[in-house]
């Protein structure tokens, strides 16, 4: 998260940490007891190491008693996710076992409407992805509230040049952005699950170069499919 | 497929005004900006401006802000420009052309003849 | 605003011919995001422009590979690298870095 701030510890009680071999990699968003959102771009280089989910977390590194890691069962892309892409962007990841739920560990509810959210919109994104142009990784769990922005500018040459589809949503990036590290993370409107941090190789920070965001609601009857 | 097409163009006499429509469909209107090209007889292109179909917000060439204005009905997908207090050289081809990617969607132009 | 100057303002040639349009700037077109926004177009008489090349180099989807973008900072350039028959037409370049957008007066290719 670039331009952000430290969380409050747990605030977030939805938030995740797609682990790679004991480090993390992506952000994620638990939406059931037993699944969590991320972004499939995440485990195109996982091949054979082992992916594990980190919930009730606030520091990576420091004890804490909500902390604990979950195996997966089970990991499904979105079917018509695609390397070179940034379209349906979307992975779920099944925990070997439902998660203890608490204070610290909650799922978040997700939009099911699928209607733009209207441009100008406060919405927070949060994650350990990196905090400045050099790379430095956060120990502790950062947010940033960006403003939504409308999908014709987003769309313009000087922007993402007509790459952003329905089911895609853009939020201003002028210094205060998410980055690398922070994709499969959520974007929340209003107390609601709306987007994914997309994870293409994106600049973070310039304004001419918005956020990328996946719309769950545009992806709800898979949602439903596969948590079924 | 995404199409544009153009129409109210024709006659007019000079000093006069006249309404242009740009009727888009095979996408989402508010999705993207939509921009106005013109093309005098056996000249090049010469950019009008733009218009955010969502905000409303307009860009304009200085050359047009005075007489030229854009405006929409997104239940129509529909983009317009009016043009008012028309010359002689205001005579070409007039398009409208969206913008992402690049120019890569035009509609097929619709003539405006300014004349006495 | 920021002219663009094209050379030549049309030229004769026969099938199979490499071709070359030069565009020059009054000034830089890179753009404050780092990227360069220079585009060329073709138009046939009678019809709306065609995008062929965006970003200076990068050909638009389903066009032939015998066109070719290249340049930076004020000098871009437009190959055919062999013209045939469907490729005589009208080529404007156009950058968009800048407010207002602006086209170059175009290079009418003709057949010889």
């Known amino acids: 998260i670039l331009g952000g701030r430290e969380a409050e510890a747990h605030a977030r009680p939805y938030m995740a940490s797609v682990q790679l071999n004991g480090a993390h990699l992506c952000g994620g968003v638990l939406v059931a007891e037993q699944w969590v959102l991320s972004a499939a771009h995440c485990l195109e280089d996982a091949a054979d190491g082992k992916v594990q989910v980190l919930l009730g977390a606030h520091s990576l590194s420091q004890p804490e008693p909500s902390k604990r890691l979950y195996d997966v069962l089970r990991a499904v892309p979105h079917p018509d996710s695609q390397p070179d892409t940034i379209d349906h962007d979307l992975l779920l990841l099944q925990l070997s076992e439902k998660a203890t739920l608490g204070p610290a560990v909650r799922p978040l509810p997700w939009q099911r409407v699928d209607r733009d959210v209207a441009p100008g919109t406060l919405c927070d994104v949060a994650g350990w992805g990196i905090v400045n142009h050099a790379g430095r990784r956060p120990d502790s769990l950062q947010h940033v509230l960006l403003p939504v922005l409308d999908r014709a500018t987003c769309n313009r040459r000087t922007h993402h040049d007509g790459a952003i589809t329905e089911r895609l949503m853009c939020a201003e990036s002028n210094r205060r952005d998410s980055c690398k590290g922070d994709s499969g993370g959520p974007l929340v409107c209003g107390g609601v699950l709306e987007g994914v941090v997309t994870s293409g190789s994106r600049v973070c920070g310039n304004r001419k170069k918005p956020g990328i965001y996946t719309r769950v609601a545009s992806y709800a009857a898979w949602i439903d499919s596969v948590l079924a | 497929e995404v199409q544009l097409v153009e129409s109210g163009g024709g006659l007019v006499q000079p000093g006069g005004s006249l309404r242009l429509s740009c009727a888009a469909s095979?996408?989402?209107?508010?999705?993207?900006?939509m921009n106005w090209v013109r093309q005098a007889p056996g000249k090049g292109l010469e950019w009008i401006g733009d218009?955010?179909?969502?905000?409303?917000?307009?860009d304009y060439n200085a050359d047009f802000k005075r007489r030229f204005t854009f405006s929409l009905d997104t239940s129509k997908s529909t983009a317009y420009l009016q043009m008012n207090s028309l010359r002689a050289e205001d005579t070409a081809v007039y398009y409208c052309?969206?913008?992402?990617?690049?120019?890569?969607?035009w509609g097929q132009g619709t003539l405006v003849t300014v004349s006495s | 605003d920021i002219q663009l100057t094209q050379s030549p303002s049309s030229l004769s040639a026969s099938v199979g011919d490499r071709v070359t349009i030069t565009c020059r700037s009054s000034?830089?077109?890179?753009?404050?995001?780092?990227?360069?926004?220079l585009e060329w177009y073709q138009q046939k008489p009678g019809k709306a422009p065609n995008l062929l090349i965006y970003?200076?180099?990068n050909r638009f989807s389903g066009v032939p590979s015998r066109f070719s973008g290249s340049g930076s900072g004020t000098d871009f350039t437009l190959t055919i690298s062999s013209l045939q028959p469907e490729d005589f037409a009208t080529y404007y370049c156009?950058?968009?870095?800048?407010?207002?957008?602006?086209f170059g007066q175009g290079t009418k290719v003709e057949i010889k």
């Open positions: 052309t969206r913008e992402g990617p690049s120019f890569a969607y």
């Open positions: 095979g996408y989402k209107f508010t999705s993207y900006y």
């Open positions: 218009i955010n179909p969502v905000t409303g917000d307009t």
């Open positions: 000034q830089t077109i890179v753009h404050s995001n780092g990227d360069t926004y």
């Open positions: 970003k200076v180099s």
């Open positions: 156009f950058q968009g870095s800048h407010v207002p957008v602006t």
